[in-house]
Interface confidence: medium
Amino acid sequence: QAACPESWIGFQRKCFYFSDDTKNWTSSQRFCDSQDADLAQVESFQELNFLLRYKGPSDHWIGLSREQGQPWKWINGTEWTRQFPILGAGECAYLNDKGASSARHYTERKWICSKSDIHV
């Protein structure tokens, strides 16, 4: 199981950070990077449900983005495998109270960082 910093939440060998603050998508990723993490990569339906449960009602950026006409990709460059629907026509994904949606990168939202637990 995950051994995470105190402000983070452990779930299935990963650590997640939920922000209070709001930033645009790029600044959110910059923050996560400063914490040796990335905007959250969601790798299973269980993980998605965990994040939806913990984040509360606010929208939170996650680590999915796309170039115009290109497929969704995670921060690490791997393609999104359509584990869940992403609504909207934006280029950056976020979690809302129902699931995932998308918006323009410059809009401000809370965010979720994730990192693998290296202490396991």
């Epitope: 199981q1 105190e6 402000s7 939440i9 452990g10 209070d20 914490q35």
Partner: antibody, heavy 117, light 112 residues
Framework: QITLKESGGGLVQPGGSLRLSCTVS????????MTWVRQTPGKGLEWVAN????????HYVDSVKGRFTISRDNAENSLYLQMNSLRGEDTAVYYC??????????WGQGTLVTVSS | DIVMTHTPLSSPVTLGQPASISCRSS???????????LSWLHQRPGQPPRLLIY???TRFSGVPDRFSGSGAGTDFTLKISRVEAEDVGVYYC?????????FGHGTKVEIK
């Protein structure tokens, strides 16, 4: 259903020792930091100590440093507080609590420790 | 250590009316990670405390929406929009930004 249950409290003489236990169920114990908090009628609620998921990080309030030791056994879903060199001012109800995002989100019912001669 | 100061220490309230409790910290509770780790707890006589609000304004699961938290820096407020009989007891603020974690002495809410 998440439950935390403390045990091990009782009457002990000044200078004596006690070991408190907290057994949990209903969540993955090894995923959470855990905390001991005590409550006295005079001083109210006082944070005592906390411990990281894997036990590698521990913090204590100054008044118990060197006397109390927090530990955990993830295989047994148990949290412990070894209390040595007990003093009258350690008399309190001791609660274990689960940490989540630096809040104390679930609490046990508490166990009473009385230090008196 | 961070000192957490409640006002008022006691608050007689009328059922169905709003109530407000304040908590002030002796220094800022904003963490370097951008979050503010200020929680509110409620304790009824003979029971352990229970979490109402964490990170200033996030309601814990199962907490009625008549409870809300606000504030920043050093000044924080818990509001009850319509007091119900079950809301009596002592309300505590607690900070978890700095070590040691510290609690306020509490505000006792009782029905007029």
């Amino acid at each position: 259903q998440i439950t935390l249950k403390e045990s091990g409290g009782g009457l002990v003489q000044p200078g004596g020792s006690l070991r408190l236990s907290c057994t949990v169920s209903g969540f993955t114990f090894s995923n959470n930091w855990m905390t001991w908090v005590r409550q006295t009628p005079g001083k109210g609620l006082e944070w005592v100590a906390n411990i990281k998921q894997d036990g590698t990080e521990k913090h204590y309030v100054d008044s118990v440093k060197g006397r109390f030791t927090i530990s955990r056994d993830n295989a047994e879903n148990s949290l412990y507080l070894q209390m040595n060199s007990l003093r009258g001012e350690d008399t309190a109800v001791y609660y274990c609590a689960r940490n989540s995002q630096r809040s104390f989100d679930y609490w046990g019912q508490g166990t009473l420790v009385t230090v008196s001669s | 250590d961070i000192v957490m100061t409640h006002t008022p220490l006691s608050s007689p309230v009328t059922l169905g009316q709003p109530a407000s409790i304040s908590c002030r910290s002796s220094q800022s509770l904003e963490h370097t990670d951008g979050n503010t780790y200020l929680s509110w707890l409620h304790q009824r006589p003979g029971q352990p405390p229970r979490l109402l609000i964490y990170k200033v304004s996030t309601r814990f699961s199962g907490v009625p929406d008549r409870f809300s938290g606000s504030g920043a820096g050093t000044d924080f407020t818990l509001k009850i929009s319509r007091v119900e009989a079950e809301d009596v007891g002592v309300y505590y603020c607690v900070q978890a930004t700095h070590y040691p974690r510290t609690f306020g002495h509490g505000t006792k809410v009782e029905i007029k």
